[in-house]
Structure formats: C-alpha cells, structure tokens
C-alpha cells in the first residue's frame, strides 16, 4: 500500500490548491456563498472543514474539502458546528479561503504541521 | 466586508490611563496578527505595537514600552490597547489594523482620537 504523504507535505500541497482558488477567481466563489466564522477550539484544520463542508454544489472548494478532510482527526459532517463561536457571524467564502490561505502559510513557516 | 471599528479615545490628563478597543468583522480574526498604529497631528504613521494569532507574543515601540499593553480576545474578536501613564506626545489618532507580511492582507480601521491634555 502507498506510504502515507508527510504532513509537511500534505500542507505545502493544500497551501498551493488556496493558492490557485484565490489566483483564479474570476466570478465570485462559490456564487458569494457565505460560511460561518470560526474559533480555534477545534484546531484550524477541523474548525476550517465544520464551515466549508456546508458549502454545496461549488466544485472550486471540493478538493479543498477533501485535502482538509485528510487533517482532521474526527469526522465532519454539515451543520456540525463544535468549533463555531457566534452562530450569527458569516462571512464570504472566498474571504474565508484568502484568510485560511494567510493562515496555513504563517503555520507552514512556523512548522507546526499538525 | 472586513470591518475594524476602533473605541475608547478620548481626551485624558498626563499620567492617565484609557484603553483602546478594536472590533473585528467580516474575516477571520484569530487567524491574523494584529497591531496598533499611531500618527500624530502633522506626522507620519507610526507603529505602536502588535501581537501574534495566538496572543502569546507581543512587540512593542521604545516609545510605550512599559506604558502599553497589547491582548487580543479571539472568542470576542477584538483587539486592545490598555494605554497607562499617558504624555501628551501620546496625542494621535490610533488605528487598529492586521499585522501580516503578505501583500492583499492590509485591513485598517477608521482611527480613534486620543488627546492627552491638561
């Protein structure tokens, strides 16, 4: 059976798909499509996977989803929200993606790979 | 949109205490490093302090170290600036604003006035 990718690895290859979603966007993402805010109780990964898997029929965030799905220990399901913090604050998902591409990046540089 | 909607300036004697606060909306607050900058009447911008993601690393200006105190609550998305032993070179307009090195990412907020005077 195939090794498993390093994290490291796995995390380099998810900054560069944000990369091309954030380069690439022409009509607005996921036709505007709004996400809930998070918190970090979850953890960055889990806590980005609670509010992007409630995004449907937007195939420009499907192989994200799938990529953050690989980090998250635990299974996520739509309208899961441990890691949300104020039901009300909702923002694009595209803004959503730009700030957990910023995010990723800083982690990247730091190391911390889980 | 991203919004940052500074409070709590105002006028204040030398030697007194105010805090500053700076509410954040339309992005993911714990996710950036914050800060604090300053312009003065008829100055330039100056940058007064920042803080990590986290809340665990804080840097600060000479100018108000020992002074200033820096704290971010992520559940509450804001931002502070606890200001003691206030001067009047303290005297400025203070904007909260994100602190991140990669270009695209500048959020500023509209400033809030602080006046130090007797």
């Known amino acids: 059976s195939p090794s498993p990718v390093p994290r490291s690895t796995a995390l380099k290859e998810l900054i560069e798909e944000l990369v091309n979603i954030t380069q690439n966007q022409k009509a607005p993402l996921c036709n505007g499509s709004m996400v809930w805010s998070i918190n970090l109780t979850a953890g960055v990964y889990c806590a980005a996977l609670e509010s992007l898997i409630n995004v449907s029929g937007c195939s420009a965030i499907e192989k994200t989803q799938r990529m953050l799905n690989g980090f998250c220990p635990h299974k996520v399901s739509a309208g899961q929200f441990s890691s949300l913090r104020v039901r009300d604050t909702k923002i694009e998902v595209a803004q959503f993606v730009k700030d957990l591409l910023v995010h990723l990046k800083k982690l990247f540089r730091e190391g911390r790979f889980n | 949109g991203v919004q940052l909607l500074e409070s709590g300036g105002g006028l204040v004697q030398p030697g007194g205490s105010l805090r500053l606060s700076c509410a954040a909306s339309?992005?993911?607050?714990?996710?950036?490093?914050m800060g604090w900058v300053r312009q003065a009447p008829g100055k330039g911008l100056e940058w007064v302090s920042s803080i990590d993601w986290k809340g665990g690393k804080t840097y600060y200006a000479d100018s108000v170290k020992g002074r200033f105190t820096i704290s971010r609550d992520n559940s509450k998305n804001t931002l502070y600036l606890q200001m003691n032993s206030l001067r009047a070179e303290d005297t400025a307009v203070y904007y909260c604003?994100?602190?991140?090195?990669?270009?695209?990412?500048?959020?500023w907020g509209q400033g809030t006035l602080v006046t130090v005077s007797s």
């Open positions: 339309g992005f993911v607050f714990p996710w950036y490093d």
């Open positions: 604003a994100t602190a991140e090195d990669e270009p695209g990412y500048d959020y």
